[in-house]
Amino acid sequence: EEELQVIQPEKSVSVAAGESATLNCTATSLIPVGPIQWFRGVGPGRELIYHQKEGHFPRVTPVSDPTKRNNMDFSIRISNITPADAGTYYCVKFRKGSPDVELKSGAGTELSVRAK
């Protein structure tokens, strides 16, 4: 049995330009200790979308449901979506260290943007 699962339940989300997009992610545990970060794309050129403790992400808001008893919610909402936001978003668990070590990624959620 896996010690930690990172679950992105939606394979794809479609949002009209100007609206907000909710990207869902849950992890089965806080252990191993370390942050969850959101990225768009994969590999060395991926773009950091949200980090709880570092950086400024004015369009991104955590929208977790703290009442969920059986897992931890790390979902986010991105406001004022534009066509430039299209892409695949990944919720990634890191293990705390110096530096933090990437441990596990969700399967990704593809965001497509419809015209208004």
């Epitope: 010690e3 930690l4 806080l30 191993p32 969850i36 703290p66 919610d73």
Partner: antibody
Framework: EVQLVESGGGLVKPGGSLRLSCAAS????????MSWVRQTPGKGLEWVAT????????YYPDSVKGRFTLSRDNAKNSLYLQMNSLRAEDTAVYYC???????????WGQGTTVTVSS | DIVITQSPASLAVSLGERATISCRAS??????????MHWYQQKPGQPPKLLIY???NLESGVPDRFSGSGSRTDFTLTINPLQAEDVATYYC?????????FGGGTKVEIK
């Protein structure tokens, strides 16, 4: 019904060792993060050690790091705390506790008493 | 380390009245909209029992006269109305960052 039953406490001299055990039943032990928390009249509740559901990751506060070792056997639904180089300040009631998400302590055992004294 | 200051150390409240306990953390215990502060009840000779998880969520089977509130650094446990079986010591606990720490406890008695 969830049950956590601790054993292995007792009287030991400073510098000595003890191994505490916790037998779990009534839940899927292998899915839970497990911890030990101790309680003293003077210092209240103090987190002692935590282990991930599969046993790969362990965490300790500085007060016990290098002296205590936490392990688990999921096949036996058991948790173990090996305590070496015991000090008088380790005297406490030791509770085994489960954490489904590695956050709050869901269930606690009744505790086992460890006394370190010459 | 995150230090938790719990107050008051003891509290005497009349039956049917409201009991309020506070915990203040030395730094925020919030992450992704979760507040990692929890509340436990301990009666003499028994282990602690989870009452409230993540600041405001009532654990299954716990009476709804118990409630929790707060975020970031300031948290409150409220018992309303207080009943005789609520006589106990109450502890808060943060799991926002290691090492996990507890408040010093509040002993609730009947006035």
């Amino acid at each position: 019904e969830v049950q956590l039953v601790e054993s292995g406490g007792g009287l030991v001299k400073p510098g000595g060792s003890l191994r505490l055990s916790c037998a779990a039943s009534g839940f899927t032990f292998s899915s839970y993060v497990m911890s030990w928390v101790r309680q003293t009249p003077g210092k209240g509740l103090e987190w002692v050690a935590t282990i991930s559901s599969g046993g790969t990751y362990t965490y300790y506060p500085d007060s016990v790091k290098g002296r205590f070792t936490l392990s688990r056997d999921n096949a036996k639904n058991s948790l173990y705390l090996q305590m070496n180089s015991l000090r008088a300040e380790d005297t406490a009631v030791y509770y085994c506790a489960s954490q489904l998400t590695g956050s709050e302590f869901d269930y606690w055992g009744q505790g086992t008493t460890v006394t370190v004294s010459s | 380390d995150i230090v938790i200051t719990q107050s008051p150390a003891s509290l005497a409240v009349s039956l049917g009245e409201r009991a309020t306990i506070s915990c203040r953390a030395s730094e925020s215990v919030d992450s992704y909209g979760n507040s990692f502060m929890h509340w436990y009840q301990q009666k003499p000779g028994q282990p602690p029992k989870l009452l409230i998880y993540r600041a405001s969520n009532l654990e299954s089977g716990v009476p709804d006269r118990f409630s929790g509130s707060g975020s970031r650094t300031d948290f409150t446990l409220t018992i309303n109305p207080l009943q005789a079986e609520d006589v106990a010591t109450y502890y808060c606990h943060q799991s926002g960052d290691l090492p996990w720490t507890f408040g010093g406890g509040t002993k609730v008695e009947i006035k």
